[in-house]
Each structure stands twice: as structure tokens, then as C-alpha cells.
């Protein structure tokens, strides 16, 4: 069964900078990746970026740079302009769409214990419930 992993990390040098890494583990070629925060897109979450393997990327503030890392993984750099750091308690969700297999999505957040600059381990949280 395909899976999606989500990893959120805080940059060591800039505590206001975060990076979300997402990857797809499974067969099929990825047609589209949607990244959102505050929950899944369509379920109260806000879209941050949409990445297409051929047509490029679209991103919305506070997303700074969305890019493909491999054919099945992406990264999204975020700039937190606020004094406090709301990203630290935020859920980030990634949805990978593969044709004709379908879509898989997962959410993750910065682990509370993680030190700045240390890469948080992948924390996949498969979305199985409709009321998230």
C-alpha cells in the first residue's frame, strides 16, 4: 500500500524558518502534490503550494520556495514573519496524486522536543477520518 511521509524541521540559523519535506512511497508516477497547513486542503486547511512535475509550482504566503527533491518527494520552505512561531504548533499536510491509482495524504508537525536544526524523523499521520 502506498504511503506518504511528512517531516517538518526548523532551521538552526533562523528560528523563523521552517521546511516541510514530504515523500510518496509506492508505485506510480506523481501527477500533483498539494501542501496545506492547519489541516487537509478542503477540510479547513489552507493551501500553501501545488507542485506539478511538468508545469511547475504555485505557492502562497507564507510559503517561500516549493521544489521537487526527487520524482516522489518535495520540500517547501516557509518564512514565519511573526514574532512568535505559530508554525511550531501547526499541522502540515501533503497530498500526492498519482494517475490512475489515486491520492494519498498524510499530515505532520514539528515534534515538540526537536531542537532547532535537527532533522525531525518522518512522522506520517495517514488521514483515515473524514472529520479531521
Amino acid at each position: 500500500t502506498p504511503e506518504v511521509w511528512v517531516q517538518v524541521q526548523m532551521e538552526a540559523t533562523e528560528l523563523s524558518s521552517f521546511t516541510v519535506h514530504c515523500g510518496f512511497l509506492g508505485p506510480g508516477s506523481i501527477s500533483l502534490v498539494t501542501v496545506s497547513w492547519g489541516g487537509p486542503d478542503g477540510a479547513g486547511g489552507t493551501k500553501l503550494a501545488v507542485l506539478h512535475p511538468e508545469l511547475g509550482t504555485r505557492q502562497w504566503a507564507p510559503a517561500r520556495q516549493a521544489r521537487w527533491e526527487t520524482q516522489s518527494s518535495i520540500s517547501l520552505a516557509l518564512e514565519d514573519s511573526g514574532a512568535s512561531s505559530p508554525f511550531a504548533n501547526t499541522t502540515f499536510c501533503c497530498k500526492f496524486a498519482s494517475f490512475p491509482e489515486g491520492s494519498w495524504e498524510s499530515c505532520g508537525s514539528l515534534p515538540p522536543s526537536s531542537d532547532p536544526g535537527l532533522s525531525a524523523p518522518p512522522t506520517p499521520v495517514p488521514i483515515l477520518r473524514a472529520d479531521l
Epitope: 501527477s31 487537509p40 478542503g42 477540510a43 494517475f99 490512475p100 483515515l128
Partner: antibody
């Protein structure tokens, strides 16, 4: 303007074969996923076969696996559905459709359909 | 495969009425739901994608909502030209599946 025009339907004997074609125009055919959808006499819609824009990944409805083959000819902007060992339950109106990545794979354009009747 | 249960099967309404069609998925399909309109003698036409996004040229009297398993399609102020069969469809997991359709008739 995006256009999809199907042809090749007709009356065929039980166990016979038929090849449906769909000529696409108004868009870059090679960049889109395509599919064949049929509408049964009861007006139910079923996705019969689909092909990724990479022409590698395909999908077939369980009941047509091993009997139907979806393919495309990029040079001729044409989608095909080769149907063999036809059964009475294959009687339907067959549509070709384009899938849009940015619309969650919704089928944003459909052809006018071609009718297939399998008789005993 | 995911079953899309669409209700009602038939709707008889007057022009100007508000119409609601529901679609229930047998498991979560996220927001990967589309709605199509099929007028008599025509092929289906895309109306809504990602539940609530209107396709190009679709009037704003058509709206959609829902997430997960429960979806609603609404026509505010039905017009005579809305006479058609409406289908929901999920594209979350292969095989893509359609609802059974709702036939809208105008009094």
C-alpha cells in the same frame, strides 16, 4: 477549442471484436491522462479504461481486464480502445474523456460518444 | 471499490426552487469529488471539481460542499435549462466511481 470525437462503435456479435477511436484536438494530447467511460442502457456511468500521460500506467475495470486494451497514437492525436471477446454487458454508449491534474483528475472534456451493441 | 450513493434518484421542482442533491462515499474520498450534468441527448459536462470549485463558464447558482464521506450539490434558483441528470464522482482512489445519478425534472 478542446474537442474529442469518438468513432468505431456499432453492432457486433457476442464474442466479437471492435476497435473504438477518439480523435483529440485543441490541446496537447500527449500531456493529458485519457480514459474511456461507458454509459449502460440503465444510464449508469463506469470508467472502463484509463491511460496516464506517460502511456505506461493504465487502469482497467475488472470486468474488462484481459479483453480490452487502451492505447494512444500521439502522432495522430488518437486514443484507442481495442475490445475483444465482447459480452452482452458491454453494450453501452462509450465516451472518451480528458482528465485534468489540477482538477483532481476530474474529466473536464468528454466526446459525444459512440454506441456499442453486442447481440447474440 | 468506493461506492458513491447518490440521493434522491428523481427530483420534480419548479423554476426558482432550490435543489439539493447528496452523495455519500463508502469511505473517505478527501475532497476529490466532481459533479457532472448530462442534458438529454448530450454527453456529461463537468460542473464542479474538488467539491466546490466551479468549472469554466458554470453559473454561480451551482455550489458544492463537503469533505470525507458526505457531499452536497446545490442549485439555487433552478432554471428550465437545468433539466438534466446530475452525477457525482470520486477520483480519490482507483477505480474512479460515479453516483447513480439524479434526474431533475421541471414542473
Amino acid at each position: 477549442d478542446v474537442q474529442l470525437v469518438e468513432s468505431g462503435g456499432g453492432l457486433v456479435k457476442l464474442g466479437g471484436s471492435l476497435k473504438l477511436s477518439c480523435v483529440a484536438s485543441g490541446f496537447t494530447f500527449s500531456s493529458y491522462h485519457m480514459s474511456w467511460i461507458r454509459q449502460t442502457p440503465e444510464k449508469r456511468l463506469e470508467l472502463v479504461a484509463a491511460i496516464n500521460s506517460n502511456d505506461i500506467n493504465t487502469y482497467y475495470l475488472d470486468t474488462v481486464k484481459g479483453r480490452f486494451t487502451i492505447s494512444r497514437d500521439i502522432a495522430k492525436n488518437t486514443l484507442h480502445l481495442q475490445m475483444s471477446s465482447l459480452k452482452s454487458e458491454d453494450t453501452a454508449l462509450y465516451y472518451c474523456a480528458r482528465h485534468e491534474d489540477y482538477y483532481g483528475f476530474a474529466m473536464d472534456y468528454w466526446g459525444q460518444g459512440t454506441s456499442v451493441t453486442v447481440s447474440s | 471499490s468506493i461506492v458513491m450513493t447518490q440521493t434522491p434518484k428523481f427530483l420534480l421542482v419548479s423554476a426558482g426552487d432550490r435543489v439539493t442533491i447528496t452523495c455519500k462515499a463508502s469511505q473517505s474520498v478527501s475532497n476529490d469529488v466532481a459533479w457532472y450534468q448530462q442534458k438529454p441527448g448530450q454527453s456529461p459536462k463537468l460542473l464542479m471539481y474538488y467539491v466546490s470549485n466551479r468549472f469554466t463558464g458554470v453559473p454561480d447558482r451551482f455550489t458544492g460542499s463537503g469533505y470525507g464521506t458526505d457531499f452536497t450539490f446545490t442549485i439555487n434558483t433552478v432554471q428550465a435549462e437545468d433539466l438534466a441528470v446530475y452525477f457525482c464522482q470520486q477520483a480519490y482512489r482507483s477505480p474512479w466511481t460515479f453516483g447513480g445519478g439524479t434526474k431533475l425534472e421541471i414542473k
